[in-house]
């Protein structure tokens, strides 16, 4: 069987696969998922292995009309790096070179400067290039390599393997060599792979459940200790509980030196952040620290200084924390919209079952808004997802110049951030270069503020307006308004009424549903307008909801169904990749960022229409 | 690289008792298993009794009953408690870890104790 980094070269001109008869004749073959032979992969960024043989696919010479043959795999030698051109041309890197099906008389694959149908190759059973099925480097744990990447194929006692392997050992560990000759290096790591006993390279806290790796003998940037303890399906370190840092204080008081965690700055228009996306709720900075020179946007626990953390350039090589099992969060239960009949005084307005309120123009110091709050019958809003923001941003009538009282503070324990109504903290958003918790300044309250709505801390002593939130009152069952403009079951934001499909559906199906009310899958034209649509779907417990945008029509160019320009994008990590596809908003801890998934999945989606009685604004000029 | 220490070797009456010991050291992460094999003169070395990390333990049918085989964890020490023993003459006992390490080999062997029950 294929494993998922296999894949057969396919010509659809000839519909034949290639095939390694031998190192020195690399033909075409009617295509056989079982055949060994035809069995190739990515082993780096630019090398292509026979699984067969365990060697590389490379030319003698860069030039034209050479015949294309097994080497060791060297990953050194320019006469084995490969790259894919545009569609799907497969090239020797650097040159107009193409790997070519041969001729009548040429039964070897060539090495050829026309780039025709008989230079395209596809990954067999799909319409994908060679690169789609890419190379992903594995970084090792413990061993003597510092935690380098497993080199494939690598040799050990004479022998070549291509996967991680026990051999050499009784207990079933695997590992791999992080060079190709393990018999002269002697370079090697323990491979990050589920396998008996692999659980020892973990520490549990029993009281949490939680488990954490010290990875201390590893000197990885922070990028590529992220994604090694991604590939042990962690994360690095947050850390969000103050027991939490104690246990991680006892766990390295041994070491000395720094180790990455998960807090950085990366995000352009945010805040310091979690990279598990855990809430920025508790702080440990060593003194002066964070530092504000510009590219120091990771953080390093530092063992040697009681465990505090430090902010320094991401491409420094340190060790690393990963953490997996049970969040610390507490679990919070956030009701989806629709569950909540909603109904709210006047002048509030209602939200996933609660009411709103800005206080603009009466600037009150924290504690006095939140006297007021309470008298009303609420207190200082808390905000628990990006939904909940969202919806403050676009439907509450906050203001770009806005500076407004939240709840949330480290009054009561200097250095961890609580809500002021006592709910646990889920979710921050912070402001570039906050919490600063500037010490000469005691900065212990908190406002939302710019046009984003994100957070600061803040004197407390300031005189601002404030956000008030309270339990909305169900009063039976709730009224559907008909919004000014919108049919019945349509809600109206700006110009334009949306409605949720409930019919789970393909791309193209919600496409024709959403013409048939002669409506389009929605378009999403800034950020406000995503901020009302996160909010609008976020909360509900569907994955998925299909937006406008594909790249169905241009491979690699994502368009509106309608015509109209891509002006603004919210895109997930990794995302859009290089698989074609359509684009559909996520839900959850990831709520209103952008996935590409396959056009013919089935998921939920949002319809969009002009406002009956609108008056269209100019499109904009270019 | 790892080291192994036996100790505890020597003369035995039939029915008598003797404690082995096996300490490891060195660049050690973790120890898997640990087990003490014998060899008779002439013949195939043998697996006696074998512990994992976990605490998971197995006996030859030969000593089952007789020999336990505890650890100390906090020293990376296994014992050989061996009980009610057999006028067998003169086997070498030797000891084994099973360890993550600075190499890909896990075994790491001792030199072995002698035991010898005299009649």
């Known amino acids: 069987l294929l494993d998922t980094r296999q894949f057969l070269i396919y010509n659809e001109d000839h519909k034949r696969c290639v095939d390694a008869v031998s190192p020195s004749a690399v033909q075409t073959a009617a295509c056989n998922q079982d055949a060994e032979s035809q069995k190739f992969r990515w082993v780096s960024e630019s090398q292509i292995m026979s699984v067969a043989f365990k060697l590389c696919l490379g030319v003698p010479s860069k030039t034209d009309w050479v015949a294309i043959t097994l080497y060791a795999c060297d990953s050194k030698s320019e006469f084995q790096k490969w790259e894919c051109k545009n569609d799907t041309l497969l090239g020797i890197k650097g040159e107009d070179l193409f790997f070519n099906y041969g001729n009548r008389q040429e039964k070897n694959i060539m090495l050829y400067k026309g780039s025709g149908l008989w230079s395209r190759w596809k990954i067999y059973g799909t319409t994908d290039n060679l690169c789609s099925r890419g190379y992903e480097a594995m970084y090792t744990l413990l061993g003597n390599a510092n935690g380098a990447t497993c080199a494939f194929p690598f040799k050990f006692e004479n022998k070549w393997y291509a996967d991680c392997t026990s051999a050499g050992r009784s207990d079933g560990w695997l590992w791999c060599g992080t060079t190709t000759d393990y018999d002269t290096d002697k370079l090697f790591g323990y491979c990050p792979l589920k396998f008996e006993g692999s659980e020892s390279l973990w520490n549990k806290d029993p009281l949490t459940s939680v488990s954490y790796q010290i990875n201390s003998k590893s000197a990885l940037t922070w990028h590529q200790a992220r994604k090694s303890c991604q590939q042990q399906n962690a994360e690095l370190l947050s850390i969000t509980e103050i027991h939490e840092q104690t246990y991680l204080t006892g766990l390295t008081s041994s070491l000395t030196s720094g180790l990455w965690i998960g807090l950085n700055s990366l995000s352009f228009n945010s805040g310091w952040q979690w990279s598990d996306r855990s809430p920025f709720r508790y702080l440990n900075w060593l003194p002066g620290s964070p530092s504000a020179e510009p590219g120091k946007s990771c953080v390093s626990l530092n063992p040697g200084k009681n465990a505090k953390w430090e902010n320094l350039e991401c491409v420094q090589k340190l060790g690393y924390i990963c953490k997996k099992g049970n969040t610390t969060l507490n679990s919070f239960v956030i009701p989806s919209e629709s569950d909540v009949p909603t109904h709210c005084p006047s002048q509030w307005w209602p939200y996933a079952g609660h009411c709103y309120k800005i206080h603009r123009d009466e600037k009150k110091i924290q504690r006095d808004a939140l006297t007021t709050c309470r008298k009303e019958g609420g207190d200082l809003t808390s905000i628990h997802t990006i939904e909940e923001l969202d919806f403050i941003i676009s439907q509450l009538g906050y203001e770009p110049n806005d500076e407004l009282w939240i709840g949330l503070n480290d009054i009561k324990i200097q250095m961890y951030f609580e809500w002021s109504d006592g709910t646990p903290v889920t979710f921050t958003k912070w402001l570039r270069g906050e919490p600063s918790h500037e010490n000469n300044r005691q900065e212990d309250c908190v406002v939302m503020k710019g046009k984003d709505g994100y957070w600061a801390d803040r004197g407390c002593e300031w005189p601002l307006g404030y956000i008030c939130k309270m339990k909305s009152r169900s009063q039976g069952p709730e009224i559907v308004e008909v919004e000014k403009g919108c049919r019945k079951g349509w809600k109206k934001h700006h110009f334009y009424c949306y409605m949720i499909g409930h019919t789970l559906s393909t791309f193209a199906e919600a496409n024709q549903t959403c013409n048939n009310e002669n409506a389009y899958l929605t378009t999403i034209e800034d950020r406000y307008e995503q901020a009302f649509l996160t909010s609008f779907v976020g909360l509900r417990p569907e994955k998925y909801f299909w937006t406008g945008l594909s790249d169905i029509q241009t491979k690699g160019t994502f368009q509106w169904t309608i015509e109209e320009e891509v002006r603004f994008t919210h895109w997930n990590s990794d995302m859009p990749g290089r698989k074609p596809g359509c684009v559909a908003m996520r839900t959850g801890i990831a709520g209103g960022l952008w996935d590409v998934l396959k056009c013919d999945e089935k998921a939920k989606f949002v319809c969009k229409h002009w406002a009956e009685g609108v008056t269209h604004p100019p499109k904009p000029t270019t | 690289d790892v080291q192994l220490v036996e100790s505890g070797g020597g003369l035995v009456q039939p029915g008598g008792s003797l404690r082995l010991s096996c300490a490891a050291s060195?660049?050690?992460?973790?120890?898997?298993?640990m087990g003490w094999y014998r060899q008779a003169p002439g013949k195939q070395r043998e697996e006696v009794a074998a512990?994992?990390?976990?605490?998971?333990?197995n006996y030859a049918d030969s000593v089952k009953g007789r020999f336990t085989i505890p650890r100390d964890n906090a020293r990376n020490t296994v014992y050989l408690q061996m009980n009610s023993l057999n006028p067998e003459g003169a086997d070498v006992y030797s000891c084994?870890?099973?360890?993550?390490?600075?190499?890909?080999?896990?075994?790491?062997w001792g030199q072995g104790p002698l035991v010898t029950v005299y009649s």
């Open positions: 060195g660049s050690i992460f973790t120890i898997n298993a």
């Open positions: 512990i994992t990390s976990g605490g998971r333990t």
């Open positions: 084994k870890a099973v360890v993550v390490t600075t190499t890909p080999y896990s075994d790491s």
